[in-house]
């Protein structure tokens, strides 16, 4: 025997009363599939979340983050504060990258400049808080009289971070 509830379309739920099989979802609730026994409460985009798509009787609201924050997690379930390039987020707020490290994103953490000498190369362009160094040809490849920029840089061997 077919379940009578299976006839209830999205946007409705299956009532217990025999005379009233399919009941529209009440305000601020939805059902996205047919045959549901109850409607789900709409997601509310509050605080650092803002509404990207309003809730309807057949689909949940969708949120994103307010300016100055970025989404994390499925369906933007979390918002994390942005920082500027050249910074990283700590509990005390956005902090500039330490000398010898950089961050080219508005999120994430600073990481050390590449140590060009580990690859037998020289520094072509100095690193900054926002950008990694650019490595050039090895010192031996440079023509006589040419010099490369060689600022002090922390080692960037795998597994080692600046302290």
């Amino acid at each position: 025997l077919q379940d009578p509830c299976s006839k209830c379309p999205a946007g409705t739920f299956c009532g217990k009363n025999k005379n009233q099989i399919c009941i529209p979802c009440p305000p601020n609730s939805f059902s996205s599939t047919s045959g549901q026994k109850a409607c789900d409460i709409c997601r509310q985009c509050k605080g650092v979340f803002r509404t990207r798509k309003e809730c309807s009787s057949t689909s949940n609201a969708e949120c994103d983050c307010t300016p100055g924050f970025h989404c994390l997690g499925a369906g933007c379930s979390m918002c994390e504060q942005d920082c500027k390039q050249g910074q990283e987020l700590t509990k005390k707020g956005c902090k500039d990258c330490c000398f010898g490290t950089f961050n080219d994103q508005k999120r994430g953490i600073c990481r050390p400049w590449t140590n060009c000498s580990l690859d037998g190369k020289s520094v072509l362009v100095n690193g900054t808080k926002e950008r990694d160094v650019v490595c050039g040809p090895s010192p031996a490849d440079l023509s006589p009289g040419a010099s490369s920029v060689t600022p002090p840089a922390p080692a960037r061997e795998p597994g080692h971070s600046p302290q």
């Epitope: 499925a74 994390e80 990481r111």
Partner: antibody, heavy 116, light 108 residues
Framework: QVQLVQSGAEVKKPGESLKISCKGS????????ISWVRQMPGKGLEWMGK????????NYSPSFQGQVTISADKSISTAYLQWSSLKASDTAMYYC?????????WGQGTLVTVSS | DIELTQPPSVSVAPGQTARISCSGD??????AHWYQQKPGQAPVVVIY???NRPSGIPERFSGSNSGNTATLTISGTQAEDEADYYC???????????FGGGTKLTVL
């Protein structure tokens, strides 16, 4: 949608080498850290290390430094965890997770069994 | 590196409040995050940055963090909350993530 899909379960003998993988999709793989987390049978979560796929910079937990190698190939959005010589004590579930502090997406886990 | 200590187990009657502690030297100076793990599943964030709750996580979950202790509180605990819970923090000394040993929450 964002997904991290890990390679299948492995059964190995002590002394053998192994490389397991974690393929990311649905986001800019190069610009998010990937961490590896170990869970031995019936035990808790242990953070092993992380990699920034954009430039393959790695950072290890002192407990795992020199024991494993983390790498990535950003061209195929895949991170790797490898051992050169497995031990019975490496038997565990290994998870990859996106992030360095907040791990917002996790792989399904790769079960590694090392037994003679 | 910082060490995070959790009680191995906590038991609570349905409808009661469960509190799971996570202690570590000056953990209040760092963000604490909490994960729930059910058998055979990957962990899921239930609290991030000390006190923030991801959407989709019930309002009964809350968190706090100050001094040497971070706390996960589950008010009106339900049977479905039975799981292992892990605290974690990212430390800028060593640039590593540390997990607590985990707490098995049993709903009686």
């Amino acid at each position: 949608q964002v997904q991290l899909v890990q390679s299948g379960a492995e059964v190995k003998k002590p002394g053998e080498s192994l490389k397991i993988s974690c393929k990311g999709s649905g986001y800019s793989f190069s610009t998010y850290w990937i961490s590896w987390v170990r869970q031995m049978p019936g035990k808790g979560l242990e953070w092993m290390g992380k990699i920034y796929p954009g430039d393959s910079y790695t950072n290890y937990s002192p407990s795992f430094q020199g024991q494993v190698t983390i790498s990535a190939d950003k061209s195929i959005s895949t991170a790797y965890l490898q051992w050169s010589s497995l031990k019975a004590s490496d038997t565990a579930m290994y998870y990859c997770a996106r992030g360095y502090g907040i791990f917002d997406y996790w792989g399904q886990g790769t079960l590694v069994t090392v037994s003679s | 590196d910082i060490e995070l200590t959790q009680p191995p187990s906590v038991s609570v009657a349905p409808g009661q409040t469960a509190r799971i502690s996570c202690s570590g030297d000056n953990i209040g100076d760092q963000y604490a995050h909490w994960y729930q793990q059910k058998p055979g599943q990957a962990p899921v964030v239930v609290i991030y940055q000390d006190k923030n709750r991801p959407s989709g996580i019930p309002e009964r979950f809350s968190g706090s963090n100050s001094g040497n202790t971070a706390t996960l509180t589950i008010s009106g605990t339900q049977a479905e909350d039975e799981a292992d819970y892990y605290c974690s923090t990212y430390t800028f000394v060593g640039f590593t993530t540390v997990f607590g040993g985990g707490t098995k929450l049993t709903v009686l």
